[in-house]
């Protein structure tokens, strides 16, 4: 049977707004990812800010609301905006546990979704780890 | 097919540790919550709580705070669940479960002194 | 913590009759996200529990449909359209909407 949708939660310093009421925080240890359950929907988020091929999370957590995407079984960033010049931030959300602790590939940032990514790459079979 | 095999009944003096073992086979282990169970001797169930084995996070029954550690062995597809400072009201058959569908055959530990 | 009561806590049925065993929570069991994590499951004797429901109405794989789910909110049913001699046991409901997860106290369902 399913359980409530668990996502790993992190906001990174001077984030501006927080999703942190849209689930409840689980009590982790240090060593390991904070982890929230959903409390609205059964979605989680990514976003991700790159630049100069350098990938940092920005926001891990809950969507508020079960939208498309959210049927993902993995974290697919897409590419969202530029907040400036050189740097793009990805997002992703995705339907299953903790999908959204990491990526397998970032797309470039100026084609959405297109194959041959020169974004940072995680060799066939691996997936990139975001260290919290 | 999917199967969970505990491992075999303990006797434990009140104070001591005892540590459950639950080997998992017939599915990917790090994509399934595993949970424990326990049952007294003839009384009810009682959720201790639950372990994600792709990361160890783990959500307890407040009760058993302090008191339970829950881990996986990921390479050998294995949860264990230890229980420390026994009292003779831990008495009970310990079960683990995939995610709540298929379950192990339970653990008999028994508290005595 | 949330208190789930079951009734009857026993219930005595002749072979191809139908049951029913009610569920009642002490709190809603619809969480956030619209779903109601609200489990049945039947253990029978020298056993380790079996799940037969979940989401309230979804049978699992391999349950007989003789086993059925209903229900919302805090007050849920497992009907059972005739009962056979392999459905002895004590049925459990179970909630997973809050934490600490919680089972009912169970119904044994013995053959008049």
């Known amino acids: 049977p399913p359980n409530r949708r668990t996502c790993v939660f992190f906001e990174a310093p001077g984030v501006q707004g927080s999703t942190k009421t849209l689930g409840e925080l689980l009590d982790t240890g240090p060593e390991l990812p904070r982890a929230i359950r959903c409390l609205y929907s059964r979605c989680c988020f990514g976003i991700w800010n790159l630049t100069q091929d350098r990938a940092q999370v920005e926001m891990q957590g809950c969507r508020d609301s079960d939208e498309p995407g959210c049927e993902s079984l993995h974290c697919d960033p897409s590419p969202r905006a530029h907040p400036s010049p050189g740097s793009t931030l990805f997002t992703c959300s995705c339907g299953t546990d903790f999908c959204n602790a990491n990526y397998s590939h970032l797309p470039p940032p100026g084609s959405p979704g297109t194959p041959g990514s020169q974004g940072p790459q995680a060799a066939p079979g691996e997936s990139i780890w975001m260290a919290l | 097919q999917v199967q969970l095999v505990q491992s075999g009944a303990e006797v434990k003096k009140p104070g001591a540790s005892v540590k459950v073992s639950c080997k998992a086979s017939?599915?990917?282990?790090?994509?399934?919550?595993v949970s424990w169970v326990r049952q007294a001797p003839g009384q009810g169930l009682e959720w201790m709580g639950e372990?994600?084995?792709?990361?160890?996070?783990?959500n307890f029954n407040e009760k058993f705070k302090g008191r339970v550690t829950m881990t996986t062995d990921t390479s050998t597809s294995t949860a264990y669940m230890e229980l420390r400072s026994l009292r003779s009201d831990d008495t009970a058959v310990y079960y683990c479960?995939?995610?709540?569908?298929?379950w192990g055959q339970g653990t008999l530990v028994t508290v005595s002194s | 913590d949330v208190v789930m009561t079951q009734s009857p806590l026993s219930l005595p049925v002749t072979l191809g009759q139908p049951a029913s065993i009610s569920c009642r929570s002490s709190?809603?069991?619809?969480?956030?996200?619209?779903?109601?994590?609200l489990e049945w499951y039947l253990q029978r004797p020298g056993q380790s529990p079996r799940l037969l429901i979940y989401?309230?109405?979804n049978r699992f794989s391999g349950v007989p449909d003789r086993f059925s789910g209903s229900g919302s909110g805090t007050d849920f049913t497992l009907k059972i359209s005739r009962v056979e001699a392999e459905d002895v046991g004590v049925y459990y409901c179970f909630q997973a909407t809050h934490d600490p997860n919680t089972f009912g106290q169970g119904t044994k369902l013995e053959i008049k």
């Open positions: 017939g599915y990917t282990f790090t994509d399934y919550w």
């Open positions: 479960a995939r995610q709540r569908d298929y």
């Open positions: 709190q809603s069991l619809e969480y956030g996200d619209r779903y109601t994590y």
């Open positions: 989401g309230v109405s």
């Open positions: 372990i994600y084995p792709k990361n160890q996070v783990s």
